[in-house]
């Protein structure tokens, strides 16, 4: 079977600071040197791109400076962190992996990680 399998956790709870981390692991059918990882958010039937990064195997994963994502890579495993999340960002976050080079191109899409974000309660005013 030449299809690429992508695994990611089913559920992740964001921290009180709005940070969520999860691992995206892929079983590569070929020896890719250039890999593109994209995080997609699916809400209802709408799919939007959250962030994306292309990296050379053995090198670090670099997202754009203004991206809400950071990440590290190790072999066929990518550790992704999404920051600045709020309760309204709760949803299904899909890891998409593309083997860009050398040919042939392969696409792999995970089943998605449901990220739950709970806005912290505002601190009550304290009277002294």
């Amino acid at each position: 079977c030449k299809a690429m399998h992508v695994a990611q956790p089913a559920v992740v709870l964001a921290s009180s600071r709005g940070i969520a981390s999860f691992v995206c692991e892929y079983a590569s059918p070929g020896k890719a040197t250039e890999v593109r990882v994209t995080v997609l958010r699916q809400a209802d039937s709408q799919v939007t791109e959250v962030c994306a990064a292309t990296y050379m195997m053995g090198n670090e994963l670099t997202f754009l400076d203004d991206s809400i994502c950071t990440g590290t890579s190790s072999g066929n495993q990518v550790n992704l962190t999404i920051q600045g999340l709020r309760a309204m960002d709760t949803g299904l976050y899909i890891c998409k992996v593309e083997l860009m080079y050398p040919p042939p191109y392969y696409l792999g899409i995970g089943n998605g990680t449901q990220i739950y974000v709970i806005d912290p309660e505002p601190c009550p005013d304290s009277d002294f």
Epitope: C1, K2, A3, M4, H5, P29, T38, L40, V47, T48, E49, T54, I94, K96, M100, Y101, P103, P104, Y105, Y106, L107, I109
Partner: antibody, heavy 118, light 107 residues
């Protein structure tokens, strides 16, 4: 709404060249890979070429490799297909199609007919 | 390259009939399979992706199943507006190959 509009088709002699264009609107063009797909008269769909969102990667069907070149101008929201050394078997309706974020082709243009004949 | 083979190449059925079209990939493509509908003289339209996920706005009488190499498109109750040619497509890897198409007609 998402729109793809092809142009540039016509009748051309074997061995000559033609350039097709695909004007996109209604979405962030620079975020999507775009494909060319063709359909010979009375035949099925044949994938021709794709170009990545930023133009960094291109793939071609074996039948057009070395003769066709796909390109894009993100500042003009336009995709191109330069077709050289045209053959009779290249006669087809040429569609541009958007590769969705999840992979399949979710929006298609209306197509432009290319006829290669002497 | 992955070859996609559809069967039958054409079929004729009555309104209300259940219609099944099969698509076989020459090697495993997991669930990276799409189905398209092309009505006569019209542009192809995405019906189903990920083998079984209905594209937004597509009637629920259409369904897809399968994984690996064998896939099925089912129309649970054929309607006159379903007269079209249906294509399966691999999008697991390049090239993005299509099946040869199945023409559906009304008896």
């Amino acid at each position: 709404q998402v729109q793809l509009v092809e142009s540039g088709g016509g009748v051309v002699q074997p061995g000559r060249s033609l350039r097709l264009s695909c004007a996109a609107s209604g979405f962030t063009f620079s975020s999507y890979g775009i494909h060319w797909v063709r359909q010979a008269p009375g035949k099925g769909l044949e994938w021709v070429a794709v170009i990545w969102y930023d133009g960094s990667n291109k793939y071609y069907a074996d039948s057009v490799k070395g003769r066709f070149t796909i390109s894009r101008d993100n500042s003009k929201n336009t995709l191109y297909l330069q077709m050289n050394s045209l053959r009779a078997e290249d006669t087809a309706v040429y569609y541009c199609a958007r590769g969705s974020l999840l992979g399949p082709f979710d929006y298609w243009g209306q197509g432009t007919l290319v006829t290669v004949s002497s | 390259d992955i070859q996609m083979t559809q069967s039958p190449s054409s079929l004729s059925a009555s309104v209300g009939d259940r219609v099944t079209i099969t698509c076989r990939a020459s090697q495993g493509i997991s669930n990276y399979l799409a189905w398209y509908q092309q009505k006569p003289g019209k542009v192809p339209k995405l019906l189903i992706y990920a083998a079984s996920t209905l594209q937004s706005g597509v009637p629920s009488r259409f369904s897809g199943s399968g994984s690996g190499t064998d896939f099925t498109l089912t129309i649970s109750s054929l309607q006159p507006e379903d007269v079209a040619t249906y294509y399966c497509q691999n999008y697991n890897s390049a090239p993005w190959t299509f099946g040869q198409g199945t023409k559906v007609e009304i008896k």
